[in-house]
């Protein structure tokens, strides 16, 4: 039994790091393998992760962590029984994939304006709480070409757009994802999408009638 593709890990910079690897043949990951991980710090205990299958020869493990600081470094040991298959290390801050935003809501009660709000996936004590920016994807269910991305580069988890920038009378869906420039993270997964019917009043077109003034001499 050998490791074909070495473990690669990403961290949510809060509580979970996910490691994936491939073996050289079909493997029952949960019965045959164990991934031991330990924070390189005083008093830190070794923890055991039981991997799950991820395709025939692929394995995935979810490493649970109490907290995280920028300097963290973990040792990783992949065991098959008494045989050490691979030894490595992992710095969560260098491989961050943020958590996906949640609770995406479209507020349509403001006249001619759509307000999209969502929740920051981190608690205030986490460094990423104040460092996330977002991308909002809006698309039409009726027209695949009607697909747009709005970049939200401010910290507030909301976006206002004029309803008139979208077609009236049809259904749209929206989803949001996050990233953090400070740790050069990858994008998070997309949030679950939310659907709404876009309807707004077309502005009343005023036809300008030109009044001819007759000047009497």
């Amino acid at each position: 039994m050998k490791v074909l593709q070495e473990p690669t890990c990403v961290s949510d910079y809060m509580s979970i790091s996910t490691c994936e690897w491939k073996m050289n043949g079909p493997t029952n990951c949960s019965t045959e393998l164990r991934l031991l991980y330990q924070l390189v710090f005083l008093l830190s205990e070794a923890h055991t992760c039981i991997p799950e299958n991820n395709g025939g020869a692929g394995c995935v493990c979810h490493l649970l962590m109490d907290d995280v600081v920028s300097a963290d470094n973990y040792t990783l040991d992949l065991w098959a029984g008494q045989q050490l298959l691979w030894k490595g290390s992992f710095k969560p801050s260098e491989h961050v994939k943020p958590r996906a935003p949640g609770n995406l809501t479209v507020h349509t009660n403001v006249s001619d304006t759509l307000l999209l709000t969502w929740s920051n996936p981190y608690p205030p004590d986490n460094y990423l709480y104040n460092h996330l920016t977002y991308a909002v994807n809006i698309w039409s269910e009726n027209d695949p070409a009607d697909f747009r991305i709005y970049n939200v580069t401010y910290l507030e988890p909301s976006l206002r757009i004029a309803a008139s920038t979208l077609k009236s009378g049809i259904s749209y869906r929206a989803r949001v994802r996050a990233w953090a420039q400070c740790y050069n993270t990858t994008w998070s997964e997309w949030s679950p999408s939310t659907k709404w019917h876009n309807s707004y009043r077309e502005p009343f077109e005023q036809h300008h009638h030109h009044h001819h003034h007759h000047h009497h001499h």
């Epitope: 509580s15 710090f41 005083l42 109490d66 600081v69 920028s70 300097a71 608690p123 004590d125 460094y127």
Partner: antibody
Framework: EVQLVQSGAEVKKPGATVKISCKVS????????MHWVKQAPGKGLEWMGR????????IYASKFQGKATITADTSSNTAYMELSSLRSEDTAVYHC?????????WGQGTLVTVSS | DIVMTQTPLSLSVTPGQPASISCRSS???????????LEWYLQKPGQSPQLLIY???NRFSGVPDRFSGSGSGTDFTLKISRVEAEDVGVYYC?????????FGQGTKLEIK
């Protein structure tokens, strides 16, 4: 051996500012969060705030926002807390504590007395 | 802010007898990562506090096994199976799950 050694007792006049230090040996402060805890005479423990020394990210209890400023110098492995606009109710022992992810290591405490 | 309420506020126990301290949080202290950061600290006279229990039930290294922690949700308990003279001091519960982190008001244990 892990040690968190705090600066000595201070006596200050109302309105003054004081800066307390917490010198750590036995581990690198970049590997932990450094917190400060207040204990007024004969009273209980109050969490004030914390810093991630690597990036300087701080959070404070609202009561101490504007009162306390927590900083850290990773080159000297020292955490600091500055208390401004001192009043008699700031008289207390202030403890620095490392948390990773619980308060395993405490400083000996620094008594700050505010008196005119 | 989450309020941590300890009962009783003082306790007088005969050596060799058990002791129990309750700590109730004003709301759930389950962190968004699923863990409950409920800890117990003992401050002996003239000393800085010391960690006894972390994550509700885990004894810190070097802590005698007569100390045990239990509870969930908002109700937590520290038990000392047989009190010894060296156990005197003030016991504090603490929640480190939600900012601002908060301590209980303390329970003073003395020996009869």
């Amino acid at each position: 051996e892990v040690q968190l050694v705090q600066s000595g007792a201070e006596v200050k006049k109302p309105g003054a500012t004081v800066k307390i230090s917490c010198k750590v040996s036995g581990f690198n402060i970049k590997d932990t969060y450094m917190h400060w805890v207040k204990q007024a005479p004969g009273k209980g423990l109050e969490w004030m705030g914390r810093i991630d020394p690597t990036n300087g990210y701080t959070i404070y209890a609202s009561k101490f926002q504007g009162k306390a400023t927590i900083t850290a110098d990773t080159s000297s492995n020292t955490a600091y807390m500055e208390l401004s606009s001192l009043r008699s109710e700031d008289t207390a022992v202030y403890h620095c504590v490392s948390r990773r992810p619980w308060f395993a290591y405490w400083g000996q405490g620094t008594l700050v007395t505010v008196s005119s | 802010d989450i309020v941590m309420t300890q009962t009783p506020l003082s306790l007088s126990v005969t050596p060799g007898q058990p002791a129990s301290i309750s700590c109730r949080s004003s709301q759930s202290i389950v962190h968004s990562n699923g863990n409950t950061y409920l800890e117990w600290y003992l401050q002996k006279p003239g000393q800085s506090p010391q960690l006894l229990i972390y994550k509700v039930t885990n004894r810190f290294s070097g802590v005698p096994d007569r100390f045990s922690g239990s509870g969930s949700g908002t109700d937590f308990t520290l038990k000392i199976s047989r009190v010894e003279a060296e156990d005197v001091g003030v016991y504090y519960c603490f929640q480190g799950s939600h900012v601002p982190y908060t301590f209980g008001q303390g329970t003073k244990l003395e020996i009869k």
